[in-house]
């Protein structure tokens, strides 16, 4: 037992209970007394004193520790004062005495972490544990400590955090609500196909923790890193009192990387089938997996069964673009979609990459829009386009880009949300290329940009400056 945890207890006779159905008391003696010198006597109010069987442990350079474990569970009663005293049988001395309540001397045994794995978002960690005394778990609170597992730096920063049992699992809230609409109409929300906000370094991690019974979710970790973690518990101080127990044995876990690093992009064209694509790695094979989860609060079974995402032929449309792996699967509109990509390198090492979860209506990719134009006067163009999806006209935003012949840089314009056309002033007697693309970014639907339309070539008439 880690009795050093009771160091703050000023009582010479220290007592603790692991489960509130047991009691262990001990004290230390510097004097070298014969075995059998001491008796530990105890009594509840108006009851005859009884002796608790003692064992002794010799402690080098100090003396002897005398320990008694109450032999009978019936002798351990909550909410009654227990009078204890140590009697010297050879000398007329009561060495020490105290009155305690068993319900106030808890020192819980450490929980055993039975599973630690990546959560549903990059940088999340899901842990589950078993409580050695499940019958008291409702009266305990838990603390987790963890840090990056860096072989080069064993004294890496450590985070200690109290687990808030009343919070619900944040990973199961609706992922990525479209609050980005408060910005410009085509501002990027954080989506599975885009860079999210950069994680803070572990020394500054303000990681969120939630727990449900014997499980908890940590977020804000570095995707792709290894972590060690430990758990301990303490009576809640309301129903039962006591001290923090010892830390559990450390477990280590390798978090999946963030699939953003692979350029993962998932989309649906029909709100039924989802296609995912990512950059093919050199000298490596890769495979996509998915699962659907319901948005309910803290489910007991947080460990998903990943299904194979059906592989498509690899595409390499041009030398300038990276080779992509693609896969597809049938989805549902009532579930959150989770994507995992496993990359196997030539030596056979498997690296996992997790995408940010999304609903199918957040991954609707529009068809490429058609761009029509006419020149009203020299260099003055009137543009018009059809909405690729009339059912979401008010949630569709566009980007128009153009460049002068022989130029490499593009100028990008963002027409107002829902616009069906606009005007453009260009330099007279010049040649231009124009392209248009569309995406959904409204309260109901969101998704990635469509492909750019085929370049529309424009040669402006003479005179009129822009």
């Amino acid at each position: 037992q880690d009795v050093s945890l009771l160091a703050s207890d000023s009582e010479p006779l220290k007592c603790f209970s692991r489960t509130f159905e047991d009691l262990t008391c001990f004290w230390d003696e510097e004097e070298a007394a014969p075995s059998g010198t001491y008796q530990l006597l105890y009594a509840y109010p108006r009851e005859k004193p009884r002796a608790c069987p003692l064992s002794s442990q010799s402690m080098p350079h100090f003396g002897t520790r005398y320990v008694c474990q109450f032999p009978d569970q019936e002798e351990v009663r909550l909410f009654f004062p227990l009078h204890l005293w140590v009697k010297n049988v050879f000398l007329n001395q009561t060495r020490t005495q105290r009155v305690l309540f068993v319900d106030s001397v808890g020192l819980p045994a450490p929980p055993s972490i039975i599973k630690a794995m990546g959560g549903s978002q990059p940088g999340e960690l899901q842990i589950s544990w078993e409580e050695p005394a499940p019958e008291i778990s409702d009266f305990l609170r838990y603390e987790l400590r963890y840090g990056p597992r860096d072989p080069k730096n064993s004294t890496g920063p450590t985070v200690i955090q109290l687990i808030a049992t009343e919070t619900c699992c944040p990973a199961l809230q609706r992922p990525h609500s479209a609050s980005a609409l408060d910005q410009s109409p085509c501002a990027q929300p954080t989506m599975p196909w885009q860079d999210g906000p950069k994680q803070t370094s572990p020394s500054r991690e303000a990681s969120a923790l939630t727990a449900e019974g014997g499980s908890c979710l940590i977020s804000g970790l570095q995707p792709g890193n290894s972590y060690w973690l430990q758990l301990r518990s303490e009576p809640d101080g309301i129903s039962l009192g006591g001290s923090w127990g010892s830390w559990s044995l450390p477990v280590t876990v390798d978090l999946p990387g963030d699939a953003v690093a692979l350029g993962l992009q998932c989309f649906t064209l029909d709100l039924k089938n989802v296609t995912c694509q990512w950059q093919q790695q050199d000298h490596a094979s890769s495979q996509g997996f998915f699962y659907h989860s319901r948005a309910r609060c803290c489910p007991r079974d947080r460990y998903p069964i990943w299904e194979n995402c059906e592989e498509e032929e690899k595409t390499n449309p041009g030398l300038q673009t990276p080779q992509f792996s693609r896969c597809h699967f049938k989805s549902r509109n009532d579930s959150i979609i989770h994507i995992l990509v496993e990359v196997t390198t030539a030596p056979g090492t498997v690296h996992s990459y997790l995408g940010s979860p999304f609903w199918i209506h957040q991954a609707v990719r529009l068809p490429t829009p058609n761009l029509h134009w006419r020149e009203i006067s020299s260099g003055h163009l009137e543009l018009e386009w059809q909405h690729p999806s009339s059912w979401a006209a008010q949630e569709t935003c566009y980007q128009l880009r153009y460049t002068g012949e022989g130029h490499q840089d593009w100028k990008v314009l963002e027409p107002p949300l829902g616009a069906r056309g606009g005007t453009l002033e260009l330099r007279p007697r010049s040649r231009y290329r124009l392209q248009l693309r569309a995406r959904l970014n409204g309260p109901t639907y969101q998704g990635p940009w469509s492909s750019w339309s085929d370049p529309t070539r424009v040669e402006t008439a003479t005179e009129t400056a822009w």
Epitope: E31, A32, N92
Partner: antibody, heavy 118, light 107 residues
């Protein structure tokens, strides 16, 4: 100052009982400490026989337990050893002694010599 | 029972000598060891308890050491009045037992 004094018959016949008295002066045997009997055989070997504590509880050497008894008379501040069914092997000098604060025998009587012979 | 063995039953010594008497227990007695001095016709006299603690009134030339099973009584400079028999005794567990004694004799 604490003093202990043994007394008893110098000669006992085999199979009889040996009774010895230790009279303590200068300290009450009911207040504190543990009061012991030790014997020393003719070859000088010492043997602890047993004790009685301030509270009256006793413990004995298992080799003698079946035939020895230690009692006390608190009014006379005396404690006693009775050894039954003696043999010539019980010939020895018998000492009473106090177990002190440090659990060693800090005060001894001068000893009384007992011979078992027919 | 715990057996206490004093390997030398007697020593021939000279006055002023440094004398070392050893005592071995048959098991660990956790420094629950006392040393006694006995002169002919007298009761034993307590010198040291808890292996190293000198009793009040005992000259400082006497000292004790040891732990576990092995213990030593040392007299740094032997005086005439130190000629006696020395006994060790364990009080770790009953029955408390004594060593056979070591007798110091002047050469």
């Amino acid at each position: 100052d604490v003093q202990l004094q043994e007394s008893g018959p110098g000669l006992v016949k085999p199979s009889q009982s040996l009774s010895l008295t230790c009279t303590v002066t200068g300290y009450s045997i009911t207040i504190d400490y543990t009061w012991n009997w030790i014997r020393q055989f003719p070859g000088n070997k010492l043997e602890w026989m047993g004790y009685i504590t301030y509270s009256g509880s006793t413990d004995y050497n298992p080799s003698l337990k079946s035939r020895s008894s230690i009692t006390r008379d608190t009014s006379m501040n005396q404690f006693f050893l009775q050894l039954n069914s003696v043999t010539t092997e019980d010939t020895a000098t018998y000492y009473c002694a106090r177990l002190g604060r440090r659990y060693a025998l800090d005060y001894w009587g001068q000893g009384t010599s007992v011979t078992v012979s027919s | 029972d715990i057996q206490m063995t004093q390997s030398s039953s007697s020593f021939s010594v000279s006055l002023g000598d440094r004398v070392t008497i050893t005592c071995k227990a048959s098991e660990d007695i956790y420094i629950r060891l006392a040393w006694y001095q006995q002169k002919p016709g007298n009761a034993p006299r307590l010198l040291i308890s808890a292996a190293t603690s000198l009793e009040t009134g005992i000259p400082s030339r006497f000292s004790g050491s040891g732990s576990g099973e092995d213990y030593t009584l040392t007299i740094t400079s032997l005086q005439t009045e130190d000629v006696a028999t020395y006994y060790c005794q364990q009080y770790w567990t009953t029955p408390w037992t004594f060593g056979g004694g070591t007798k110091l004799e002047i050469k």
